[in-house]
């Protein structure tokens, strides 16, 4: 009789463990669902605002082909300019072609005139090679015209229709670039 009671007690305990496990799985599943729901809501919100706005670029950004550009209204050193762009989901301008350079310089002429604007180009201190922020090399026609004599880090900037170089710690305006939103229509 005692053995029978002991067996029943063990079975009950096993059942309880299984129920606890099931409850734990359910809680985990519920948490996972809530998390997915959050992502879905965020995605829907973004999609709705994009659909409502339907503009490929945010307000105050300029569009050209697949890119959106933002011309800053504040001065900063190159590294801070880079951070300012990242805060808006963009990077400092990376000029891929003469056509893009012409568009940028043409737009700047209309907006502000002949100022200095940091772009995402910097010179490697060891090799002296110019590289864009993503690690790619500029095309031969898009290398800074003058080599800065600075002992400090050297970065690229646009002025009028030229690409020039300067100590990265000098203060300039800057240009950010991000991908334009593709229309789903």
């Amino acid at each position: 009789k005692l053995l029978q009671v002991s067996t029943i007690a063990m079975q009950q305990q096993e059942k309880l463990i299984q129920q606890e496990r099931a409850l734990l799985n359910f809680t985990e599943w519920k948490r996972s669902c809530a998390l997915q729901m959050k992502y879905c809501q965020a995605f829907m919100q973004n999609s709705l605002s994009s659909a409502h706005n339907s503009s490929p670029c945010p307000n105050n950004w300029i569009q050209n082909r697949e890119s959106c550009y933002y011309v800053s209204e504040i001065w900063s050193i190159w590294h801070t300019s880079q951070e300012n762009c990242l805060k808006e989901g963009s990077t400092l301008l990376q000029i891929e072609s003469k056509e893009e350079m012409d568009f940028i310089t043409g737009s700047l002429r209309k907006i502000k005139g002949s100022y200095d604007y940091w772009v995402g180009l910097s010179q490697d201190g060891h090799s002296g090679r110019w590289l864009w922020q993503d690690g790619s090399s500029p095309s031969p026609g898009l290398l800074p015209a003058e080599r800065s004599q600075s002992a400090n880090q050297v970065c690229g900037y646009v002025k009028s229709n030229s690409l020039l170089s300067s100590n990265c710690s000098t203060w300039k305006y800057f240009i950010c670039e991000k991908y334009a939103l593709r229309s789903s229509v």
């Epitope: 990242l86 989901g89 991908y179």
Partner: nanobody
Amino acid sequence: QVQLQESGGGLVQAGGSLRLSCAASGSITSINAMGWYRQAPGKQRELVAAITSGGRLSYADSVKGRFTISRDNAESTVALQMNSLKPEDTAVYSCAAFQSSGIDWGQGTQVTVSS
């Protein structure tokens, strides 16, 4: 406010590799870009690599060609694959989340490269 949790730091021989990971939680929908900073003793904090939600990349000159940043937007995670490590890469590496309102940083993870 975004909370960031780094993992993957440690001690490695020069020429070796390490992979750092960072998971974001909290106000993740406000994140426009994620990245990694590092700070060596007595030196200024520097941005090592960053990736925007649109996939645009940014690397410090000193790591170009050696480090690769990647991001999983759905999971709100960012990883930094570090190859051909040098003693001068020794630093505390901190994950960063860039939002219009500012930058949030993680606690950091120590990376030590021995020669």
